[in-house]
């Protein structure tokens, strides 16, 4: 009973256009074209974009024109191979063009460059940026997007436009404010801070989709839509699954146009209906499009319905469980999740998906076996040490960060994790560890019972980074290996990694460790980056470092730094303490 | 507003058939195991069967192969199909919904009943 | 099948009194027993499911305990709207379930 059985349409292209309307049409194709061609100028893009529109409206006004009927990866790719440069600029993408529909498109998704070799975005004074956005508002908004969308590839195109969206009215209000800095600053770092969030949550559906299949996917939507709204009926969450799936199958096989269009008729069905779904969505319902879907994604927790018996006699005690599970494998799987989520908003997502994949393995174990009650009579036993790992875990790193603090935690964590898996790039390594860390200032001071949801499943979306990070150039088995085999256990993978001992420690390089002035001038987190990057460099260097050593070198290196920012002649400072510092930092080392 | 009704029931002769019908509003049932429970005038309540949420029905033992429960998810109705009734079939036949979709207990919603008078 | 035994089939009691009714199981069902009210011409209305958990809605002065074949349900406190029959079903040890022959509650 899913929402989306539209007739044909003898035009998809019109179809979409007019269901879209124009500004949304120009944006998302915009968005998709940036996503694929990653290194084309704005200007090539808007061309393309441009072209497309008057092509689409050709069609609207008359279906029946010449090409309309073409699908839109024809239409799509067609203009994108009409790029002069594609060979010089992409290399073998090229190729892509030599194949024919649906091949072109997936080779076109498989050349997506999730750390593409772009500039860093800076960001103008503040009334650079407001001329920029009176001068000319339409291409001051569509080169946001651009931006974004070429450098996150699998953006989540309609949550795009709600980003896009928010970003004209901060523009909008501040660039008349008195203070327009005071004003506009902190809303585009929040954006900011923000839409990397949202990149890395659409980067972990798409690769749940991508590397794992429909049934991975459906099997996490289950269970969070199941915490998420604990009263509607299993029906009803099932038809959210397979409506929400087919969503995020569109947006991340590149299908940006029916993604949003899909997206905007779930949210309509979901406020139809959110009787029978949530007495959350109330607020949600009342917004506009793009903020109401916004809202309905982020919507909290609705509360337990009363008088849930205990899964047990259904799932244990009954005699008739192997005969339930052989006729209606998924329906049985499928309510067992949704029972045990509806009931647990306080486990992560990834922790219910581990307690049901132990629940199938054990009934395919035992309905095989003599006696089947007996085998799996004690099944959820098995269920408690997998509960407790996580929170143990996380018990012992909210107090170490608690202890810490944010930046010294993240230095636990990059010590930790360049000794588990050295081989990785010290800036993937920096990235990764750095948003590890956040999770101290996002999870920790939650009350038990979110603590759980909030850290693993954001542990999840990180571990995700450093997996699509590491597919690109692979050079560590043990990433490889916690990032293939199997989703839901990537983190107890990467906790379980001890120190490599096969890695051979790098050579001492002392460029690596020669500081500038410049150090100076950057803001607080640019400084953090720098001597983070510098521990990673150490660790690789001297793996078997203790911790002791390790603190000593970086404290050390802080009052370095400090004391060279103070000089006069800080240049000459940088270069005679410096040598001095990796001299003393070796021998502290024993390197 | 969420609610049982059933339908179909009467007089019928010795060895006669009937189909009584379970006509859910305000959920879905298929997300449920779907129950028959019965009740003879002043006498106990006697569970007839059930379908669960994968559309596997079980049966006490002595309904088995006089009485067949199925359902029809897109009109919402379950079905109690009864045949060579007697009169000791005679009684309130009830539509109940289990707590889930496999559960054969408790049960929160009940309907109002049909009555079923198998006599000559 | 199990069968549930339910003692005693019928009871009288005054407005006020402490009611006990017992339900004995020929085999152990762990915790999963409901007991239900029924008054004439009207559904059975759940009132303890799973031994001992009160359903919502229900007065306090109801409670249910028990586990393995033993269980009991307990009226603290005897209401006018009390008198009815009361049945007590056995269920999760299959797809199967059983309901007792009802206690008839009856004013003294």
């Known amino acids: 009973r899913g929402v989306f059985r539209r007739d044909a349409h003898k035009s998809e292209v019109a179809h979409r256009f007019k269901d879209l309307g124009e500004e949304n049409f120009k944006a998302l194709v915009l968005i998709a074209f940036a996503q694929y061609l990653q290194q084309c100028p704005f200007e090539d893009h808007v061309k393309l974009v441009n072209e497309v529109t008057e092509f689409a409206k050709t069609c609207v006004a008359d279906e029946s024109a010449e090409n309309c009927d073409k699908s839109l990866h024809t239409l799509f790719g067609d203009k994108l191979c009409t790029v002069a440069t594609l060979r010089e600029t992409y290399g073998e993408m090229a190729d892509c063009c030599a194949k024919q529909e649906p091949e072109r498109n997936e080779c076109f998704l498989q050349h997506k460059d999730d750390n593409p070799n772009l500039p860093r975005l800076v960001r103008p004074e503040v009334d650079v940026m407001c001329t920029a956005f009176h001068d000319n508002e339409e291409t001051f908004l569509k080169k946001y997007l651009y931006e974004i969308a070429r450098r996150h590839p699998y953006f989540y195109a309609p949550e795009l436009l709600f980003f896009a969206k928010r970003y004209k009215a901060a523009f909008t209000e501040c660039c008349q404010a008195a203070d327009k800095a005071a004003c506009l600053l902190p809303k585009l770092d929040e954006l900011r801070d923000e839409g990397k969030a949202s990149s890395a949550k659409q980067r972990l559906k798409c690769a749940s989709l991508q590397k794992f299949g429909e049934r991975a996917f459906k099997a996490w939507a289950v269970a969070r839509l199941s915490q998420r709204f604990p009263k509607a009926e299993f029906a009803e969450v099932s038809k959210l699954v397979t409506d929400l799936t087919k969503v995020h199958t569109e947006c991340c096989h590149g299908d940006l146009l029916e993604c949003a269009d899909d997206r905007a008729d779930l949210a309509k069905y979901i406020c139809e209906n959110q009787d029978s779904i949530s007495s959350k969505l109330k607020e949600c319902c009342e917004k506009p499009l793009l903020e109401k879907s916004h809202c309905i994604a982020e919507v909290e927790n609705d509360e337990m319905p009363a008088d849930l018996p205990s899964l047990a006699a259904d799932f244990v005690e009954s005699k008739d469980v192997c005969k339930n599970y052989a006729e209606a494998k998924d329906v049985f799987l499928g309510m067992f999740l949704y029972e045990y989520a509806r009931r647990h908003p306080d486990y992560s997502v990834v922790l219910l998906l581990r307690l049901a994949k132990t629940y199938e393995t054990t009934l395919e174990k035992c309905c095989a076996a003599a006696d089947p009650h007996e085998c799996y009579a004690k099944v959820f036993d098995e269920f408690k040490p997998l509960v407790e790992e996580p929170q143990n875990l996380i018990k012992q790193n909210c107090e170490l960060f608690e202890q810490l603090g944010e930046y010294k935690f993240q230095n636990a964590l990059l010590v930790r994790y360049t000794k588990k898996v050295p081989q990785v790039s010290t800036p993937t390594l920096v990235e990764v560890s750095r948003n590890l860390g956040k999770v101290g200032s996002k999870c920790c001071k939650h009350p038990e019972a979110k603590r759980m949801p909030c850290a693993e499943d954001y542990l999840s979306v990180v571990l995700n980074q450093l997996c699509v990070l590491h597919e690109k150039t692979p050079v560590s088995d043990r990433v490889t290996k916690c990032c293939t085999e199997s989703l839901v256990n990537r983190r107890p993978c990467f906790s379980a990694l001890e120190v490599d001992e096969t890695y051979v420690p790098k050579e001492f390089n002392a460029e690596t460790f020669t500081f500038h002035a410049d150090i100076c001038t950057l803001s607080e987190k640019e400084r953090q980056i720098k001597k983070q990057t510098a521990l990673v460099e150490l660790v690789k260097h001297k793996p078997k470092a203790t911790k002791e050593q390790l603190k000593a070198v970086m404290d050390d290196f802080a009052a370095f730094v400090e004391k060279c920012c103070k000089a006069d002649d800080k240049e000459t400072c940088f270069a005679e303490e410096g040598k001095k510092l990796v001299a003393a930092s070796q021998a502290a080392l024993g390197l | 507003e969420v609610q049982l009704v059933e339908s179909g029931g009467g007089r019928v002769q010795p060895g006669g058939s009937l189909r009584l019908s379970c006509a859910a509003s305000?959920?879905?049932?298929?997300?449920?195991?779907m129950n028959w429970v019965r009740q003879a005038p002043g006498k106990c309540l006697e569970w007839i069967g059930h379908?669960?949420?994968?559309?596997?029905?079980y049966y006490a033992t002595w309904a088995k192969g006089r009485f067949t429960i199925s359902r029809d998810n897109s009109k919402n109705t379950v079905y109690l199909q009864m045949n060579s009734l007697r009169a000791e079939d005679t009684a309130t036949y009830f539509c109940a919904r289990g707590a889930g979709g496999f559960s054969t207990g408790p049960f929160k919603l009940w309907g109002q009943g049909t009555q079923v008078t198998v006599s000559s | 099948a199990f069968e549930l035994t339910q003692s005693p089939s019928s009871l009288s009691a005054s407005v006020g009194d402490r009611v006990t009714i017992t339900c004995q199981a020929s085999e152990s069902i762990n915790s999963r027993l409901a007991w239900y009210q029924q008054k004439p011409g009207q559904p059975p209305k759940l009132l303890i499911y799973?031994?001992?958990d009160l359903t919502s809605g229900v007065p306090s002065r109801f409670s249910g305990s028990g586990s393995g074949t033993d269980f009991t349900l307990t009226i603290s406190c005897l209401q006018p709207e009390d008198f009815a029959t009361y049945y007590c079903?056995?269920?999760?040890?299959?797809?199967?379930?059983?309901f007792g022959c009802g206690t008839k509650l009856t004013v003294l």
């Open positions: 379908i669960n949420a994968g559309d596997i029905a």
């Open positions: 305000g959920f879905s049932l298929s997300s449920y195991a």
């Open positions: 079903q056995g269920y999760g040890g299959s797809s199967t379930t059983t």
């Open positions: 799973d031994a001992s």
